[in-house]
Amino acid sequence: HTAAQDNCTCPTNKMTVCSPDGPGGRCQCRALGSGMAVDCSTLTSKCLLLKARMSAPKNARTLVRPSEHALVDNDGLYDPDCDPEGRFKARQCNQTSVCWCVNSVGVRRTDKGDLSLRCDELVRTHHILIDLRHRPTAGAFNHSDLDAELRRLFRERYRLHPKFVAAVHYEQPTIQIELRQNTSQKAAGDVDIGDAAYYFERDIKGESLFQGRGGLDLRVRGEPLQVERTLIYYLDEIPPKFSMKRLT
């Protein structure tokens, strides 16, 4: 089956249309917006999710501000072009023929240009830093308990193998989760860190992408961990190319 057996839904992506029209009457799900078939045992790619989000009624959100070589998604939502595998195409353009290059998580990594802009390859984001601030608690969380709980969460909820959770840093009230994944490190079936980070970001915002599953209930030794702010920094294998004008 490509989806939940009995009621033909997609557990990992509620922005899908599912019907029993697969081989042998099996349930098959397609992403809204693109109509692409998705594998409901794993995360849907961020590109397809953004495309689906743009096809649905929405209230646009602007994301966080950029910082040094670490890219932050400060352009907000856009309707991306995805390749046949559901990955971002290296060059993205809007309806007014303004184009720019993106990395593997769909974040702009060049100045905007026109249709003559060339983006030779999709540059991989190999390091993601998720910076969280949690609400005040009676005391600090135990660092090793927090580390273990976040690794478990990323494996069980987002299917990301713990090898890709490079580190969990904690200085109350700030938690930093470092995800690292080079192209060569990904084996068959391994979830992309960019997709895991996007699902986590949406969970933290209370906008879960999972079908019929409760929202994120994060607890460390029974104590609720409630996040009040999130910043996500993206580092690419090749540094971004912005003009000096933008940097000032």
Epitope: R151, R152, E156, K163, Q185, A187, G189
Partner: antibody
Framework: QVQLVQSGAEVKKPGASVKVSCKAS????????MHWVRQAPGQGLEWMGE????????SYNQKFKGRVTITRDTSTSTAYMELSSLRSEDTAVYYC????????????WGQGTLVTVSS | DIQMTQSPSSLSASVGDRVTITCRAS??????LNWYQQKPGKAPKLLIY???RLQSGVPSRFSGSGSGTDFTLTISSLQPEDFATYFC??????????FGQGTKLEIK
């Protein structure tokens, strides 16, 4: 076609070490996880550990408390499992198996290597 | 660690019978449940992964179902070559990945 070919049977004394090899062919060795699973005579299956051949990352079943080491040689597409401080209860058939990162299903298995620990 | 418990431990059936083997996990494992068949002196063979997906080359008389903690493997019409031992295995959480103790399917 995908094949995992393991080294031959071994007889070891208690306290010794054994190193079993698993040569992969028919697919890109660095593109799949490799796992090691053992089966004592007449018993069930027990997962021992895993490796990603691309970067050599490993994780192990804590039951083996540092006695197991999994390595690989990408130039020969071979994975190795070494078990040290052998005891009689380590007598088992040891299998390598190719794994999937999401389902953690083992779709191809080696033929198995019988390791007998006896004084 | 997650414990996997299979029932029954052994089962006698005849060719043509419909057979069901169950597997219970000690905690929710979503759909990350795989089934293997093993014949004496041979390595296990993957039959079904992710609860209900049939591995390539496996006959359609094998099917799987379930979710959460309770899972079943069904053989719709037993064939002579199906007499073997069957194992379930979870791949949901952090290592170690665990197997059920096995169900031996014998000829009645």
């Amino acid at each position: 076609q995908v094949q995992l070919v393991q080294s031959g049977a071994e007889v070891k004394k208690p306290g010794a070490s054994v190193k079993v090899s698993c040569k992969a062919s028919g697919y890109t060795f660095t593109s799949y996880w490799m796992h090691w699973v053992r089966q004592a005579p007449g018993q069930g299956l027990e997962w021992m550990g895993e490796i990603t051949p691309s970067d050599g990352y490993t994780s192990y079943n804590q039951k083996f408390k540092g006695r197991v080491t999994i390595t690989r040689d990408t130039s020969t597409s071979t994975a190795y499992m070494e078990l040290s401080s052998l005891r009689s209860e380590d007598t088992a058939v040891y299998y390598c198996a190719r794994g999937h990162g999401n389902y953690v299903s083992f779709d191809y298995w080696g033929q198995g290597t019988l390791v007998t620990v006896s004084s | 660690d997650i414990q996997m418990t299979q029932s029954p431990s052994s089962l006698s059936a005849s060719v043509g019978d419909r057979v069901t083997i169950t597997c219970r996990a000690s905690q929710d494992i979503s759909n990350y449940l795989n089934w293997y068949q093993q014949k004496p002196g041979k390595a296990p063979k993957l039959l079904i992964y992710y609860t209900s997906r049939l591995q390539s080359g496996v006959p359609s008389r094998f099917s799987g179902s379930g979710s959460g903690t309770d899972f079943t493997l069904t053989i719709s019409s037993l064939q002579p070559e199906d007499f073997a031992t069957y194992f379930c295995q979870q791949g949901y959480t952090l290592p170690p990945y665990t197997f059920g103790q096995g169900t031996k399917l014998e000829i009645k």
